[in-house]
């Protein structure tokens, strides 16, 4: 099992959560493993139990405090360890000195709502969740709209290169059902990645007025 390819990846949500995934080919599903976090300049340590998410990967969330509390800063280094039980003792399987603000992945945007809808356009707004005040306005967004007969993968990406928590979708078809998703990414961090996509927001454009050209 030890010789199988293994990987340990963690991201900080910028507030009070470090989410980790541990994968190892050939490891037994019922292996008991945990992630241990040891910050270099904090008095707390934190542990979470890795739970299986697929045949060869496990995940857990290190909850560092209240969801909106700022538990780490740009100068913190957190030593992370994967520990797996082997008989009566714990064995270290992976180690990393983790710089939280170099490894960011924010929570998905929330509270998506239709502000105004017409026949050909729709104005949508959203909010960011549990994002650090350190970012100020240094965030970007990607959005996509699901049209009838298409898949999310086929939807063109709309890029918002600033902290803009709304969008006006145009050139839509009247009386048509659409879905909309958005995701967010801080500009900071060498290994920072996009948040998960938000929950889809379903909306329908207004029908064209009778007797008028569309």
């Amino acid at each position: 099992a030890v010789n199988g390819t293994s990987q340990f990846t963690c991201f900080y949500n910028s507030r009070a959560n470090i989410s980790c995934v541990w994968s190892q080919d050939g490891a037994l599903q019922d292996t008991s493993c945990q992630v241990h976090a040891w910050p270099d300049r904090r008095r707390w340590n934190q542990t979470c139990e890795l739970l299986p998410v697929s045949q060869a990967s496990w995940a857990c969330n290190l909850i560092l405090g209240a969801p909106d509390s700022q538990k780490l800063t740009t100068v913190d280094i957190v030593t992370l360890r994967v520990l797996c039980r082997e008989g009566v003792r714990w064995r270290v399987m992976a180690i990393q000195d983790f710089k939280p603000f170099e490894n960011l992945r924010l929570m998905a945007p929330i509270s998506l709502q239709v502000v105004h809808v017409e026949t050909h356009r729709c104005n949508i707004s959203w909010e960011i969740s549990q994002a650090s005040h350190y970012f100020e306005r240094h965030l970007e967004f990607e959005a996509r709209t699901l049209s009838p007969g298409h898949t999310w993968e086929e939807a063109p990406l709309l890029t918002l290169k600033q902290k803009q928590e709304w969008i006006c979708l145009e050139t839509l078809t009247p009386d048509t059902q659409y879905e909309f998703q958005v995701r967010v990414k801080p500009l900071q961090g060498e290994f920072t990645t996009w948040s998960p996509w938000s929950q889809p927001l379903a909306f329908r454009t207004k029908p064209a007025a009778l007797g008028k050209d569309t």
């Epitope: 190892q24 992370l80 990393q96």
Partner: nanobody, 125 residues
């Protein structure tokens, strides 16, 4: 790019000690997790020890725990493996490895991007 050059290998009697050194060149060394692996004749390359870039985290193969110590000196771009109470079964070529940039040190070879050429350690009984 990280270039790695090992030194310090040699012939030693069982129960003796050796200190292996790994000299690294490359700007990212000071924020890269490092490891040592070894390959005995006719066997697969196996994990020996690893260390995080600050030196706060270490891990060892069960077979060397308590006998070997991994350390590093970032100011000199060096990683060391102090090997005490050597046994004939420690005979192997020892390789220094640099983990993938920004990634954890793991026990599998696939987690490492850069490798040295190796240094021979022979333990006679």
């Amino acid at each position: 790019q990280v270039q790695l050059v090992e030194s310090g290998g040699g012939l030693v009697q069982a129960g003796g000690s050796l200190r292996l050194s790994c000299a690294a060149s490359g700007r990212t060394f000071s924020t890269t997790e490092m490891g040592w692996f070894r390959q005995a004749p006719g066997k697969e390359r196996e994990f020996v020890a690893a260390i995080t870039w600050t030196g706060r985290g270490t891990m060892y193969a069960e077979s060397v725990e308590g006998r070997f110590t991994i350390s590093r000196e970032n100011a000199k771009n060096m990683v060391y493996l102090q090997m005490n109470s050597l046994k004939p079964e420690d005979t192997a070529i020892y390789y220094c490895a640099a983990a993938r940039r920004g990634r954890a040190a793991v026990r599998s070879e696939g987690g490492y991007d850069f490798w040295g050429q190796g240094t021979q350690v022979t333990v006679s009984s």
